[in-house]
């Protein structure tokens, strides 16, 4: 495939990545799949500046990111190391709360109204953010 040099229509460029901000809600797995179908992934936050950039665009609205612990430890969807990476959890979070009555705990991370993160039930229909790196090779065949 060819290397992507500019962002697709309706995506926003920032620091060599492209971002797409949903205006509807989906469960985490559906949001994750949506991004994959766009040759992207749910947003992976690696710095204070990226956190602030995303916050600026989503406003005070619950929004999924590419972080989950559905298989045990917390993991970023693109393989970025969680333990050594940027974190911005709300106080007392993540708490894997079981008291919601929906079955199980809370395995998916989202931005809250103040931008800090919370873990929640993955089935909740929150907005989401897709991200793809500009330097990444596109899956589309090169134009002849």
């Amino acid at each position: 495939g060819s290397e992507r040099t500019c962002c697709p229509v309706n995506w926003v460029e920032h620091e060599r990545s492209c971002y797409w901000f949903s205006r509807s809600g989906k469960a985490w797995a559906d949001a994750d799949n949506y991004c994959r179908l766009e040759d992207a992934h749910l947003v992976v936050v690696t710095s204070w500046e990226e956190q602030k950039f995303v916050q600026h665009h989503i406003g005070p609205v619950n929004t999924w990111m590419g972080l989950h612990d559905q298989n045990g430890p917390w993991k970023w969807v693109d393989g970025t190391d969680y333990e050594t990476g940027f974190k911005n959890w709300r106080p007392e979070q993540p708490d894997d709360w079981y008291g919601h009555g929906l079955g199980g705990g809370e395995d998916c991370a989202h931005f809250t109204d103040d931008g800090r993160w919370n873990d929640d039930v993955c089935q909740r229909p929150y907005r989401w953010v897709c991200e793809t790196e500009l330097d990444k090779a596109s899956q589309e065949p090169p134009l002849l």
Partner: antibody, heavy 119, light 107 residues
Framework: QVQLVESGGGVVQPGRSLRLSCAAS????????MHWVRQAPGKGLEWVAV????????YYADSVKGRFTISRDNSKNTLYLQMNSLRAEDTAVYYC????????????WGQGTLVTVSS | DIQMTQSPSSLSASVGDRVTITCRAS??????LNWYQQKPGKAPKLLIF???SLQSGVPSRFSGSGSGTDFTLTISSLQPEDFATYYC?????????FGPGTKVDFK
């Protein structure tokens, strides 16, 4: 009401150390990031450091990196600034300030404590 | 690091005047721009956060505008208690940085 009270300032010789404290009350201290900001006599404001609500992350101004350490004790509702290898240019009034979590602005400030580095 | 500049560095005005102070960032800071007022011997006081949001308890004669790199603080009708120094600050990127300040004094 929100109250922040700094202490620990004074006169210290170059190369020596000093620890500032900031006692917080009137809000849930453990839920807020905190900042140190300083102001040299007759000069403008200079941001020094920030610490996450749980102490898990910290950032510093280049001018103090490697010499100053920001920390907190949430059980005591207290913020600290450990200042080592002090220089004359560190002479300033040091303010602690509470961070608004969404915008990171400093919404409440202490009255400040004066640190004078002089031989 | 992001550099913040302010203009003017000082201005002389009279009670009732409309006062405008500008702040410029060396790169895009979106709306992560705050304005503070400081009087001699006192701690700074937050006036405006997120470029245009008025802090609780601050008189409505203060307003902020702008996004990206260019921002403005406006005092619609200067009052005696408004003579002070005003600072802008960016909180988009660490290290956070302040502008050099604008001193507003009596004409």
């Amino acid at each position: 009401q929100v109250q922040l009270v700094e202490s620990g300032g004074g006169v210290v010789q170059p190369g020596r150390s000093l620890r500032l404290s900031c006692a917080a009350s009137g809000f849930t201290f453990s839920s807020y990031g905190m900042h140190w900001v300083r102001q040299a006599p007759g000069k403008g404001l200079e941001w020094v450091a920030v610490i996450w609500h749980d102490g898990s992350d910290k950032y510093y101004a280049d001018s103090v990196k490697g010499r100053f350490t920001i920390s907190r004790d949430n059980s005591k509702n207290t913020l600290y600034l450990q200042m080592n290898s002090l220089r004359a240019e560190d002479t300033a009034v040091y303010y602690c300030a509470r961070e608004d979590p969404r915008t990171s602005c400093s919404d409440y400030w202490g009255q400040g404590t004066l640190v004078t580095v002089s031989s | 690091d992001i550099q913040m500049t302010q203009s003017p560095s000082s201005l002389s005005a009279s009670v009732g005047d409309r006062v405008t102070i500008t702040c410029r960032a060396s790169q895009n800071i979106f709306s992560y721009l705050n304005w503070y007022q400081q009087k001699p011997g006192k701690a700074p006081k937050l006036l405006i956060f997120a470029a245009s949001s008025l802090q609780s308890g601050v008189p409505s004669r203060f307003s902020g505008s702008g996004s990206g790199t260019d921002f403005t603080l406006t005092i619609s009708s200067l009052q005696p208690e408004d003579f002070a120094t005003y600072y802008c600050q960016q909180t988009y990127s660490v290290p956070f940085t302040f502008g050099p300040g604008t001193k507003v004094d009596f004409k």
